[in-house]
């Protein structure tokens, strides 16, 4: 299976969480249970978090990674768009931007990437253990699809891992690859929540010898110096199904954008917008077919011209993102 | 396996139009863009114009924008062409292939010939 | 709109012999597409993205090249090889190929 997930930055220690939480031990299994819920292809990246201020409130982000412009991106939940899945957003760089809810705020972050917060109470709030689909449309390439969901639990003595669905078009070349990597890294995570449950966590100052380092920088390449994993996911355990949406769904031709506003798409254009702007740092990306481990902040080797952030109309720190240094 | 059927040989008049087929089979026609070629004979490709069925977008090359019109049918998953005020220049292989994750796929190529 | 302009226009190879041809755009691009085609067939893309070879490609293929620039290599000549090869670019529409390299066995 092809498996592409966003990993959370390594954050500065923070008040009350020199423990367990700060343990560098923890930076691995981290980044391997995020890996372990989240598949699709190399060219797709999902990250879904829930706001631990609002547990009803989540965030969905995903990006483009692949060659070509993005002609149309659809966010739907509860599997794969076609496949049983509920459309939440549909986003033209051209005609605009679509929502349902609980969708309340989909929008455009940079020329290949699109956040989409939901939000809402009662039959058609998202949980937990929804799955989250986004599904990338490029000229002249076609379609890339990749879903995800929040880790089933953050408790470090979490019995097992959970196996991701195989996600449409999958190649038995990526299947064969990625699951031998998975397969280790739940073994490997395994071992290590059971050898932490096993003992206390030791109150560790950042160290540069700690034999984990090395492997928590492959990983999550970021300061080898910051020692605690700031995780932003809160979890809960309920197990429910995302309600079907009474509203209408984008189908037919092209006459369903009418309604829109011309400014609804807030993406640069032409050619000037593709110039070498780097997207600022958002934490790490881990392609692992590709064997790729590379900051946000850097251009991937198989993408095209550097992209560009929309003007923000709260400031740069608005631009930040989930994943953005606070 | 995936296949796309082209319509057969197409014989017109100067100044018609004609309307060539590409039927789509073993694969989701709405999520991939269908591209239209021409070839003359003996000579290189031309890149006409795309469709995505999704949602009808379009992408013509400047010198076939208003000539050629791209439609799709996704209930038939069938891609069409249609060319206007057609002449001799017009004489040629018109293909459609579709990219589906780096791998593309053509049809066998519809012959137009435009002869009074 | 970009033009391609490949070279040499026709070029003869022996087996085993080691193949080069060229295709130059004449404003920058971020990446050249080759296709191959038989005579009577319908092309076939044999590099995408400059250097990535499609799925079934036997890896005496190479692609190369930035900006103006590219190249398709063929490490040691078969006679299979033997066909015409046309290079283009999916930058800014037009989306233009080149005239094509016509590979002809000795």
């Known amino acids: 299976m092809r498996t592409e997930a966003q990993v959370p930055a390594l954050q500065p220690p923070e008040p009350g969480l020199e423990g367990a939480m700060g343990h560098r031990t923890l930076v691995l299994p981290w980044v391997l249970l995020t890996l372990c819920v989240t598949a699709g292809t190399p060219e797709v990246w999902v990250q879904v978090r829930m706001e631990a201020t609002e547990l009803s409130s989540f965030t969905i982000r995903c990006g483009f990674l692949g060659s070509g412009s993005i002609s149309l991106v659809t966010v739907s939940w509860g599997g794969p768009n076609g496949a049983g899945g509920t459309t939440l957003a549909v986003l033209h760089p051209e005609r605009g931007i679509r929502q349902w809810a609980p969708a309340r705020q989909a929008r455009w972050e940079t020329q290949s990437s699109i956040s989409l917060i939901l939000e809402g109470s009662g039959a058609s709030s998202p949980c937990a253990n929804t799955t989250f689909c986004c599904k990338f449309a490029s000229f002249p390439e076609g379609s890339w699809e990749a879903c995800g969901s929040l880790p089933p639990s953050s408790d470090p003595g979490l019995s097992a891992p959970p196996t991701p669905a195989p996600i449409l078009r999958a190649d038995l070349a990526g299947i064969l690859g990625v699951s031998g990597v998975l397969l280790f890294g739940c073994v490997y995570l395994l071992h290590l929540l059971r050898r932490h449950k096993h003992r206390p966590a030791p109150r560790l100052q950042p160290s540069r010898t700690s034999p984990q380092a090395p492997r928590a920088r492959a990983w999550a390449p970021s300061q080898a110096s910051q020692a605690a994993l700031h995780v932003p996911y809160a979890t809960i355990n309920t197990s429910c199904r995302p309600a079907t949406l009474d509203t209408a769904h984008p189908h037919g031709g092209p006459s369903w954008w009418a309604s829109l506003p011309t400014h609804a798409a807030h993406r640069p254009q032409g050619p000037a917008a593709w110039a070498s702007t780097p997207i600022p740092a958002r934490g790490s990306f881990v392609s692992v077919e590709n064997g790729l481990y590379a900051q946000a902040g850097e251009r991937p080797p198989h993408t095209g011209p550097g992209l560009t952030l929309f003007p923000d109309p709260r400031g740069p720190r608005a631009m930040e993102g989930p994943l953005g240094v606070r | 396996q995936v296949q796309l059927q082209q319509s057969g040989t197409i014989l017109a008049r100067p100044g018609a139009s004609v309307k060539m087929s590409c039927r789509a089979s073993?694969?989701?026609?709405?999520?991939?863009?269908i591209q239209w070629i021409k070839q003359r004979p003996g000579q290189g490709l031309e890149w006409i114009g795309a469709?995505?069925?999704?949602?009808?977008?379009?992408r013509y090359t400047q010198k076939f924008k208003g000539r050629a019109t791209l439609t799709a049918d996704k209930s038939s998953s069938t891609a069409y062409m249609q060319v206007n005020s057609l002449t001799s220049e017009d004489s040629a292989v018109y293909y459609c292939?579709?990219?589906?994750?780096?791998?593309?796929?053509w049809g066998q190529g519809t012959t137009l010939t435009v002869s009074s | 709109q970009i033009v391609l302009i490949q070279s040499p226009a026709i070029m003869s190879a022996s087996p085993g012999e080691k193949v080069t041809m060229t295709c130059s755009a004449s404003?920058?691009?971020?990446?050249i597409h080759w296709y191959q085609q038989k005579s009577g067939t319908s092309p076939k893309r044999w590099i995408y993205?400059?250097?990535k070879l499609t799925s079934g490609v036997p890896a005496r293929f190479s692609g190369s090249g930035s900006g103006t620039s590219y190249s398709l290599t063929i490490s040691s000549m078969e006679a299979e090889d033997a066909a015409t090869y046309y290079c283009?670019?999916?930058?800014?529409?037009?989306?233009?190929f080149g005239g094509g390299t016509k590979l002809e066995i000795k």
């Open positions: 073993d694969y989701t026609f709405t999520d991939y863009w």
């Open positions: 993205d400059t250097t």
């Open positions: 292939a579709t990219f589906i994750n780096y791998v593309d796929y």
């Open positions: 469709i995505f069925p999704e949602n009808g977008d379009t």
């Open positions: 404003s920058s691009v971020n990446n």
């Open positions: 283009q670019q999916w930058n800014i529409n037009p989306y233009t």
